[in-house]
């Protein structure tokens, strides 16, 4: 049975380590839902397309989210 079909959350471990926004390919924020009761943040890295679950409560990750949203607001018209 593929795990993804039987489990509703995605993150097995979460990383508290800072992530350089420049090394990010993509940042997904999955809100809590009936399927998974917690917010999950999944960073896709440019290097080899590695995906890493980040700790939404970590100060470093909160700073990353601020930096990314700031960058996005700069880009949007």
């Amino acid at each position: 049975v593929p795990l993804s079909r039987t489990v509703r959350c995605t993150c097995i471990s979460i990383s508290n380590q800072p992530v350089n926004p420049r090394s990010l390919e993509k940042l997904e924020i999955i809100p809590a839902s009936q399927f998974c009761p917690r917010v999950e943040i999944i960073a896709t890295m440019k290097k080899k397309g590695e995906k890493r679950c980040l700790n939404p409560e970590s100060k470093a990750i909160k700073n990353l989210l601020k930096a990314v949203s700031k960058e996005m607001s700069k880009r949007s018209p």
């Epitope: 049975v1 993804s4 959350c9 097995i12 471990s13 979460i14 990383s15 999944i42 590695e50």
Partner: antibody, heavy 124, light 108 residues
Framework: QVQLVESGGGVVQPGRSLRLSCAAS????????MHWVRQAPGKGLEWVAV????????YYADSVKGRFTISRDNSKNTLYLQMNSLRAEDTAVYYC?????????????????WGQGTTVTVSS | EIVLTQSPGTLSLSPGERATLSCRAS???????LAWYQQKPGQAPRLLIY???SRATGIPGRFSGSGSGTDFTLTISRLEPEDFAVYYC?????????FGQGTKLEIK
């Protein structure tokens, strides 16, 4: 330093129970998925069970399903394996191991920290 | 369950030689879900490679992993005396996690 220390092993009769513990130190235990892996004498590695970082999701090998229960106490930085209805074939060294930081269903970072193991012998 | 078959069972080589260890899966495994471990007698396993080809922290550059789908390889470019051990591949593409039966790398 990052460390995992197993305890609770010993000699037990078939059908009896045993509880293994794994004390974690040197890292934020509550952020990591944790595993039990065993190794019978002279044999290879066999994965036993996994518990996700916050403790709500657990998986077991078919060989132990319904007999073994993995659990954790994040306030005590401790992982447990409750083993019931033990059989001779459960005789092994039991290792606890940490799932790599940020592992998910999409990408697996391996078991990056292991304890030294605790020996369980099931014999009459 | 996905069965991993490692070959050869035993590999006899001399220090300085190149070692190539194979791991074949009974079903396709995402490369992001394949790891390699080293185990020496009386010791716990040590993570070498994750994601099929990424070296774990502190692992020397002579160790490299490659492959995708059902065929994966661990290569040790130039054997050092401390590399003689048992090597296991392991998958996490589907539950349960499974290990290969191991390849023993011994001194010729």
């Amino acid at each position: 330093q990052v460390q995992l220390v197993e305890s609770g092993g010993g000699v037990v009769q078939p059908g009896r129970s045993l509880r293994l513990s794994c004390a974690a130190s040197g890292f934020t235990f509550s952020s990591y998925g944790m595993h039990w892996v065993r190794q019978a004498p002279g044999k290879g590695l066999e994965w036993v069970a996994v518990i996700w970082f916050e403790g709500s999701i657990k998986y077991y090998a078919d060989s132990v399903k319904g007999r073994f229960t993995i659990s954790r106490d994040n306030s005590k930085n401790t992982l447990y394996l409750q083993m019931n209805s033990l059989r001779a074939e459960d005789t092994a060294v039991y290792y606890c191991a940490r799932e790599g930081a940020g592992s998910s269903l999409y990408y697996y970072y391996g078991m990056d920290v292991w304890g030294q193991g605790t020996t369980v012998t099931v014999s009459s | 369950e996905i069965v991993l078959t490692q070959s050869p069972g035993t590999l006899s080589l001399s220090p300085g030689e190149r070692a190539t260890l194979s791991c074949r899966a009974s079903q396709s495994v995402s490369s992001g879900h394949l790891a390699w471990y080293q185990q020496k007698p009386g010791q716990a396993p040590r993570l070498l490679i994750y994601g099929a080809s990424s070296r774990a922290t502190g692992i020397p550059g002579r160790f490299s992993g490659s492959g995708s789908g059902t065929d994966f390889t661990l290569t040790i470019s130039r054997l050092e005396p401390e590399d003689f051990a048992v090597y296991y591949c392991q998958q996490y593409g589907s539950s349960p996690y499974t290990f290969g039966q191991g390849t023993k790398l011994e001194i010729k």
